[in-house]
């Protein structure tokens, strides 16, 4: 069975948009009118993993760009990275674990667990412009509660 | 947690159609990803697919019976329907509904019993 | 469509032994490949995934092994518990189950 993907954009429960930052990186802020156009436009790709109620195990790629997003140490934290691939290659139905995601969809939010790093997620800061991150907490100031809008392909 | 509950009839003659029904809980088919499948088991004999729906209504059927299934859902009930046309006694099985957001079916119903006969 | 060949039909072993089952598939399936146990009245039981991976819960003595057409499950020190009949399963393409194989207490 091969890979199936959707594209989708992803706003964080502020409505703030994600958008490239340089080539690697990811940031939260808020868009409007034409600007919408610039917000990053994701290739989720449903992957074999851990399956669990509402836990859904995905890959989170940039759509026709060889990047994905990737849960790895860097100074003994779990961080949140763009990672290039061979386009090749990728998207497949086993991904290694730093690029799965457990999505948990309950009431049209979303969360994005770290496979790597159980119980860190996708995060984004209350201010305005900041990198998108792997949070280790969970209702507390930052946000890591999404909605999912789908892109035509 | 995740459930599952087949039901449909004891019974049937053969040239009828079967409509079984897969009640759940623990889990949405709104929920991008997920889908369920139906597989059934002659007593004594191995597993075989049927049929699978994902959440955007997309559907997979075992080639051999194809022209005989039918599955479809009701997201707002929990449901997943599967109608198979035309029955003979070797359509005589355990009929089981199992989740799966791949095809590694991690949650079963308890299934249900089908017999054909004359 | 792909078949998974279970090559036997039952095995015999007893309490604490450790016993492997084998599966063929028709062709290469990478390791799209599961494992199932069944208990008479019950429904199927995921054991294993990814040809290797355990599903969540399923103790450690159950192991998978093997990629492409050749797959394994070892059941090591066998418990009363694990005599059932086992399928091996495949999905890289439309699902298809093995035949089954009993384990039987010797």
């Known amino acids: 069975a091969p890979v199936r993907s959707l594209n989708c954009t992803l706003r964080d429960s502020q409505q703030k948009s994600l958008v490239m930052s340089g080539p690697y990186e990811l940031k939260a802020l808020h868009l409007q009118g034409q600007d919408m156009e610039q917000q990053v436009v994701f290739s989720m790709s449903f992957v074999q993993g851990e399956e669990s109620n509402d836990k859904i195990p995905v890959a989170l790629g940039l759509k026709e760009k060889n990047l994905y997003l990737s849960c790895v140490l860097k100074d003994d934290k779990p961080t949140l990275q763009l990672e290039s691939v061979d386009p090749k290659n990728y998207p497949k139905k086993k991904m290694e674990k730093r690029f799965v995601f457990n999505k948990i969809e309950i009431n049209n939010k979303l969360e994005f667990e770290s496979a790597q790093f159980p119980n860190w997620y996708i995060s984004t800061s209350q201010a305005e412009n900041m990198p998108v991150f792997l949070g280790g907490t969970k209702g507390g100031q930052d946000i890591t509660d999404f909605t999912m809008q789908f892109v035509s392909s | 947690q995740v459930t599952l509950k087949e039901s449909g009839p004891a019974l049937l003659k053969p040239t009828q159609t079967l409509t079984l029904t897969c009640t759940f809980s623990?889990?949405?088919?709104?929920?991008?990803?997920?889908?369920v499948s139906w597989i059934r088991q002659p007593s004594g004999k191995a597993l075989e697919w049927l049929a699978h729906i994902y959440w955007d209504d997309d559907k997979r059927y075992n080639p051999s019976l194809k022209s005989r299934l039918t599955i479809s859902k009701d997201t707002s009930s929990n449901q997943v329907f599967l109608k198979i046309t035309n029955v003979d006694t070797v359509d005589t099985a355990t009929y089981y509904c199992?989740?799966?957001?791949?095809?590694?079916?991690?949650?079963w119903g308890q299934g249900t019993l089908v017999s054909v006969s004359a | 469509d792909i078949q998974m060949t279970q090559s036997h039909s039952s095995m015999s072993t007893s309490v604490g032994d450790r016993v492997r089952i084998t599966c063929r598939a028709s062709q290469d399936v990478d390791t799209d490949v599961a494992w199932f146990q069944q208990k008479p009245g019950q429904a199927p039981k995921l054991l294993i995934y990814w040809a290797s991976t355990r599903h969540s819960g399923v103790p450690s003595r159950f192991s998978g092994s093997g990629s492409g057409t050749d797959f394994t499950l070892t059941i090591s020190n066998v418990q009363p518990e694990d005599f059932a009949d086992y399928y091996c399963?495949?999905?890289?393409?439309?699902?298809?189950f093995g035949a089954g194989t009993k384990l039987e207490l010797k």
């Open positions: 623990g889990f949405s088919l709104s929920t991008s990803g997920m889908g």
């Open positions: 199992a989740r799966s957001a791949y095809y590694s079916f991690a949650y």
């Open positions: 399963q495949q999905y890289s393409s439309y699902p298809t």
